[in-house]
Interface confidence: medium
């Protein structure tokens, strides 16, 4: 026990002596952050001049503070021990390590391309002012149906699977453990809406049945085709869309 205690003391003395010798050999090692070892003044520690800093001790020079000019603005002022930090002026956002570049913001529903901000193409969205347009969630992959359609700015909202919603279908899937017994208010509301729609549709059909002779067959076919046509989103099909057809220069939509 006494022997190991002696060893520890001896080691400590050696380390302390080494540190003292090192500081005698290199007085600069004593200079703290925020100072530099001034060779012109007999190696004494001088504070960093204005607009410069040293973040570590023992430095022989201070570094010039970063300047946030142009599109950059100061996020954190330079101090004697730390560099200034910049971010970007409104309308731009940071890119690169330490915000080395500023990139233009776009609107939600757009993405920045080589040619500036362009609208997201059909089937994609961007809910931020930066980043790229991402494809809408494919609800069917999770066995769900689309409850709310997607837009350029928002993803689709997935709802219960179509099987869950057909009145006569008996579901084989057991209910989720967390769900309380009985139907949720949303499901009941949905069934009521569905029943009402079915009744209205039936009424509409019967009315049309009697008027078909007067109006002619073509009109009837047209009415029944209409609801199933894909809606044309004119706002996304103009030249401003970031997607191009394959034969055009930009290439297709990356989904």
């Amino acid at each position: 026990m006494g022997n190991s205690c002696y060893n520890i003391v001896a080691t400590l003395l050696l380390v302390l002596n080494f540190e003292r010798t090192r500081s005698l050999q290199d007085p600069c090692s004593n200079c703290p952050a925020g100072t530099f070892c001034d060779n012109n003044r007999n190696q004494i520690c001088s504070p960093c001049p204005p607009n410069s800093f040293s973040s570590a001790g023992g430095q022989r020079t201070c570094d010039i503070c970063r300047q946030c000019k142009g599109v950059f603005r100061t996020r954190k002022e330079c101090s004697s021990t730390s560099n200034a930090e910049c971010d970007c002026t409104p309308g731009f956002h940071c890119l690169g390590a330490g915000c080395s570049m500023c990139e233009q913001d776009c609107k939600q529903g757009q993405e920045l391309t080589k040619k500036g901000c362009k609208d997201c193409c059909f089937g994609t969205f961007n809910d931020q002012k930066r980043g790229i347009c991402r494809p809408w969630t494919n609800c069917s992959l999770d066995g769900k149906s689309v409850l709310v359609n997607g837009t350029k700015e928002r993803d689709v909202v997935c709802g219960p699977s179509p099987a869950d919603l057909s009145p006569g279908a008996s579901s084989v899937t057991p209910p989720a453990p967390a769900r309380e017994p009985g139907h949720s208010p949303q499901i009941i509301s949905f069934f009521l809406a569905l029943t009402s729609t079915a009744l209205l549709f039936l009424l509409f059909f019967l009315t049309l049945r009697f008027s078909v002779v007067k109006r002619g067959r073509k009109k009837l076919l047209y009415i029944f085709k209409q609801p199933f046509m894909r809606p044309v989103q004119t706002t996304q099909e103009e030249d401003g869309c970031s997607c191009r057809f394959p034969e055009e220069e930009e290439g297709g939509c990356e989904l």
Epitope: I64, K69, G70, V71, F72, G96, M101, C102, T113
Partner: antibody, heavy 127, light 106 residues
Framework: QVQLVESGGGVVQPGRSLRLSCAAS????????MHWVRQAPGKCLEWVAI????????YYADSVKGRFTISRDNSKNTLYLQMNSLKAEDTAVYYC????????????????????WGQGTLVTVSS | YELTQPPSVSVSPGQTARITCSGD??????AYWYQQKSGQAPVLVIY???KRPSGIPERFSGSSSGTMATLTISGAQVEDEADYYC??????????FGCGTKLTVL
């Protein structure tokens, strides 16, 4: 015409330091950002660092951050790379290259690229 | 983030050489092409996908479609034999090079 000439390469032991220089001529040096790019034997080109035209703002690749320091002396038309705590993986040909942008601080997003390069100087880190 | 290039491409003199570079950010970011002849400094031959610096022969052209950028040398000549590197930045602003394609003009 634009000319960039690197010097200061050589064989050095791991943990030691080396300082590379790049002498520029044929253009107004103080108007341009400058880069160092390196190429290890049989490997891809790797961007190392950039210093803006005014010498104040500097950025580094993660692989060299804290060990390498880029600097410039506009009065001497010279770019420097101080390399400390060198590792075997720092062995490469080091090129200095001019940034294409006339004034980096004009305040718009830019994609850096290099319009003129030097011939390179070989740094070998070996024990 | 990576830019992927074929290691080598071979053509006969007078033929068209095509060198590709693929990267996920290329639909949004420009591609740049550098030529490096043995023992020499790299030379910029195409910038911003398809622009040619002054002094670069007209047979060099560039294009970009989707995630693929292409350097085309129409009527390749023996003196075009070199390593060709593509370069771009990724969506975070990091600077990235491809690993190069060795063009052989047989």
């Amino acid at each position: 015409q634009v000319q960039l000439v690197e010097s200061g390469g050589g064989v050095v032991q791991p943990g030691r330091s080396l300082r590379l220089s790049c002498a520029a001529s044929g253009f107004t040096f103080s108007n341009y950002g400058m880069h160092w790019v390196r190429q290890a034997p049989g490997k891809c080109l790797e961007w190392v660092a950039i210093i803006w035209y005014d010498g104040i703002n500097k950025y580094y690749a993660d692989s060299v951050k804290g060990r390498f320091t880029i600097s410039r002396d506009n009065s001497k038309n010279t770019l420097y790379l101080q390399m400390n705590s060198l590792k075997a993986e720092d062995t490469a040909v080091y090129y200095c290259a001019r940034d294409q942008d006339y004034d980096i601080l004009t305040g718009y997003y830019k994609e850096d690229y290099f319009d003129f390069w030097g011939q390179g100087t070989l740094v070998t880190v070996s024990s | 983030y990576e830019l992927t290039q074929p290691p080598s491409v071979s053509v006969s003199p007078g033929q068209t050489a095509r060198i590709t570079c693929s990267g996920d950010a290329l639909p949004k970011k420009y591609a740049y092409w550098y030529q490096q002849k043995s023992g020499q400094a790299p030379v910029l031959v195409i910038y911003e996908d398809s622009k040619r610096p002054s002094g670069i022969p007209e047979r060099f052209s560039g294009s970009s479609s989707g995630t693929m950028a292409t350097l085309t040398i129409s009527g390749a000549q023996v003196e075009d034999e070199a390593d060709y590197y593509c370069y771009s930045t990724d969506s975070s602003g990091n600077r990235v090079f491809g690993c190069g394609t060795k063009l052989t003009v047989l």
